[in-house]
């Protein structure tokens, strides 16, 4: 297993609709034809997998059906979007990239993106 550098933004603020997007960029030492991207969430020293996708030559990442993630790829960049976030989902979201093929296998883990989610204020009742 060889190490690889992965860069991602330090902080992202989710939209009022609970959507957060960030770019995960990896320094590929060669031309990988098969890449696996995993988003991990670290909160209170617990690490959980949020979503994962393996992609090849296409520009769209395909996630499992119940996933809250969507994404596209361009070169060594992956544009990730996480949906359905609420205030309780605030935490550090870490991008993990694996170059699956061809050998050798490379693994890179970013420093994480702190995603802040603020639940929208409920609209005040109107008399009109």
């Amino acid at each position: 297993c060889k190490a690889m550098h992965v860069a991602q933004p330090a902080v992202v603020l989710a939209s009022s609709r609970g959507i957060a997007s960030f770019v995960c960029e990896y320094a590929s030492p060669g031309k990988a034809t098969e890449v696996r991207v995993t988003v991990l969430r670290q909160a209170d020293s617990q690490v959980t997998e949020v979503c994962a996708a393996t992609y090849m030559m296409g520009n769209e990442l395909t996630f499992l059906d119940d996933s809250i993630c969507t994404g596209t790829s361009s070169g060594n960049q992956v544009n990730l979007t996480i949906q359905g976030l609420r205030a309780m989902d605030t935490g550090l979201y870490i991008c993990k990239v694996e170059l699956m093929y061809p050998p050798p296998y490379y693994l890179g883990i970013g420093n994480g993106t702190q995603i802040y989610v603020i639940d929208p204020e409920p609209c005040p009742d109107s008399d009109f």
């Epitope: 034809t33 098969e34 696996r36 393996t54 992609y55 090849m56 030559m57 296409g58 520009n59 769209e60 395909t62 996630f63 499992l64 059906d65 996933s67 969507t70 596209t72 699956m100 093929y101 061809p102």
Partner: antibody, heavy 115, light 106 residues
Framework: QVQLVQSGAEVVKPGASVKVSCKAS????????INWIKQAPGQGLEWIGR????????YYNEMFTGRVTLTRDTSTSTAYIELSSLRSEDTAVYFC????????WGQGTMVTVSS | DIQLTQSPSFLSASVGDRVTITCSAS?????IHWYQQKPGKAPKLLIY???TLASGVPSRFSGSGSGTEFTLTISSLQPEDFATYYC?????????FGQGTKLEIK
Amino acid sequence: QVQLVQSGAEVVKPGASVKVSCKASGYTFTSYWINWIKQAPGQGLEWIGRIAPGSGTTYYNEMFTGRVTLTRDTSTSTAYIELSSLRSEDTAVYFCARGDYFDYWGQGTMVTVSS
Amino acid sequence: DIQLTQSPSFLSASVGDRVTITCSASKSVSYIHWYQQKPGKAPKLLIYDTSTLASGVPSRFSGSGSGTEFTLTISSLQPEDFATYYCQQRTTYPLTFGQGTKLEIK
């Protein structure tokens, strides 16, 4: 030029298994997914699953999980689908297709399940 | 699973007509791809990533849409266009197809 050539038609008995091949040529086999699609007589298209020929990573449609196995042989640039415990509703044409966009397709293999 | 519903399921038209086929997704998807299939043949990729024409596909075919609503348009039908058309998504597994739209000669 890119070609996907599938094995010939099969007639099999209920409960038996069948293995269909898809031989790729004209491109780097390990650079594109190989997808498998089912089309029952007079019906639409159903995605069965896909395999990344380099690592062997597979994704399956849960509807087919357990009775379908996707494999590949990189030395011959050939992908395989094995269907087991066959029943009459498995009678269909099975296609292989390349990549994310299904830009090249095999000619299809008719599998008939009949006693 | 993401369901794709095509409308209409059957369409009768004449050579030279402009026809539009709609594909509605049960959930928002990033892109839709379109295929043409003739009897006894394998499907053929027409349009990928919603609006990009596949190699060798005539410019009378076009695609558009976003989110949950997508369309395939044939600006002026030619005799060779009478076939069945399928939309497909690959935003989430399992990859799914629409039920198909059969385009017949009026």
